[in-house]
């Protein structure tokens, strides 16, 4: 189960670090001359798809420098946000137009990070200081989860057949930082 | 909840060896550098040196290389501290810590060992 | 080896008072400084660093600052649970090296 394959000139990629998934940091706009991929999956296609398996949610690339202290690192890195619409084979007929929505009634999905890759970045600092490095982990792909009436409304469930399979050996990753003083600050490049 | 649980005191003879074990839950170890530090009784505190669990590179403070040896088990998220060759001067309590900065400050500390070299 | 000099090995203070502790650096260490709490029978507890920055859950009495080879850290308002003692610690270089510590102290 080793990372996607994951290429940044800046960087060294690391092997997969085996944690329980967490939302990316919230982009503060969207101003992004960034690309829409699927991460390898199948094309989401609402209209047509009946198998659940091959729905999947939006991988929107983008870039962040990545700062620590008066230090940032030389080039930008590179990762996913995931985005977009996730949900079950259930639609019905839109009253405008031809197109079909989401029956409003159904479960939650959620379009969130499915796993994570870590990078050793190098950091270049002011004034002469020598160059630091920091590893930082970054979202490598996304997944449709769900909530269901029956669960509490934070407690995410896997979509399609991982439902089942629990997840071995996995950790929350530890907050070493306030959001305030963040360990790895981040800053969007645009 | 972040934890680096280590081992129980030891009590050791002068000229043996002990290795010493920090088991890391919360994290995971190749996210980050582990370090170890040594505290003597009523004194300060020295830097043994910090090892990359991912691709195991150590830097050790020189005063300490050739005494201390660094070492990590990724399947157990464990990182270990041996000593060798042992003596008064080795009694301390040993800490383990962790940041994800090269070189760095340390977020979380173990709750640390004492080892006690007497004969 | 960069040497971190914390020349007051013991201050005295009184609960409510504003107490300042300083750490020397041999050298230019930037701002790569961290400050530690430590209670007797415990392992340390980050409280500072890049010399000035607030670790997360740190009461904001305690400030540090400086940069270069001064530093300071101040405790405003000094509470009796602030009684410990404190090490600076530079991590500009390796090998990392640390203050010998400051204990604080009442009147």
């Known amino acids: 189960q080793g990372w996607q394959a994951f290429k940044n000139d800046a960087t060294e990629i690391i092997p997969e670090l085996g944690e329980y998934p967490e939302p990316p940091p919230e982009l503060e706009n969207n101003k992004t001359m960034n690309r829409a991929e699927n991460g390898g999956r199948p094309p989401h296609h609402p209209f047509e798809t009946k198998d659940v398996s091959e729905y999947s949610c939006r991988e929107l690339h983008f870039t962040r420098y990545v700062t620590d202290g008066p230090c940032r690192s030389a080039k930008p890195v590179t990762e996913l946000v995931c985005s977009g619409q996730c949900g079950p084979a259930r639609l019905l007929p839109n009253a405008i137009g031809r197109g079909k929505w989401w029956r409003p009634s159904g479960p939650d999905f959620r379009c969130i990070p499915d796993r994570y890759r870590a990078q050793r970045v190098q950091l270049l600092c002011p004034g002469g200081e020598a160059p630091r490095a920091r590893k930082v982990r970054l979202v490598a792909s996304c997944k449709c989860k769900r909530l269901t009436r029956f669960h509490n409304q934070s407690e995410l469930k896997d979509f399609g057949t991982e439902a089942a399979r629990p997840q071995k050996g996995r950790k929350p990753r530890p907050r070493a930082r306030s959001a305030k003083a963040n360990q790895a600050e981040l800053e969007n490049a645009y | 909840e972040v934890q680096l649980q280590q081992s129980g005191a030891e009590l050791v003879r002068p000229g043996a060896l002990v290795k010493l074990s920090c088991k890391a839950s919360?994290?995971?170890?190749?996210?980050?550098?582990m370090h170890w530090v040594k505290q003597r009784p009523e004194q300060g505190l020295e830097w043994i040196g910090r090892?990359?669990?991912?691709?195991?590179?150590?830097i050790y403070d020189p005063k300490f290389q050739g005494k201390a040896s660094i070492t990590t088990d990724t399947s157990s998220n464990t990182a270990y501290l041996q000593l060798s060759s042992l003596t008064s001067e080795d009694t301390a309590v040993y800490y383990c810590?962790?940041?994800?900065?090269?070189?760095?400050?340390?977020?979380?500390w173990g709750q640390g060992t004492l080892v006690t070299v007497s004969s | 080896d960069i040497v971190m000099t914390q020349s007051h090995k013991f201050m005295s203070t009184s609960v409510g008072d504003r107490v300042t502790i300083t750490c020397k650096a041999s050298?230019?260490?930037?701002?790569?400084v961290a400050w530690y709490q430590q209670k007797p029978g415990q392992s340390p507890k980050l409280l500072i660093y890049?010399?000035?920055t607030r670790h997360t859950g740190v009461p904001d009495r305690f400030t540090g600052s400086g940069s270069g080879t001064d530093f300071t850290l101040t405790i405003s308002n000094v509470q009796s649970e602030d009684l410990a003692d404190y090490f600076c610690?530079?991590?500009?270089?390796?090998?990392?090296?640390f203050g010998a510590g400051t204990k604080l102290e009442l009147k």
């Open positions: 810590a962790y940041d994800a900065g090269d070189p760095a400050w340390f977020t979380y």
């Open positions: 919360g994290f995971n170890i190749k996210d980050y550098y």
């Open positions: 090892i990359d669990p991912e691709n195991g590179d150590i």
């Open positions: 050298q230019d260490v930037f701002t790569a």
């Open positions: 890049w010399a000035s």
């Open positions: 610690q530079q991590y500009s270089s390796y090998p990392l090296t």
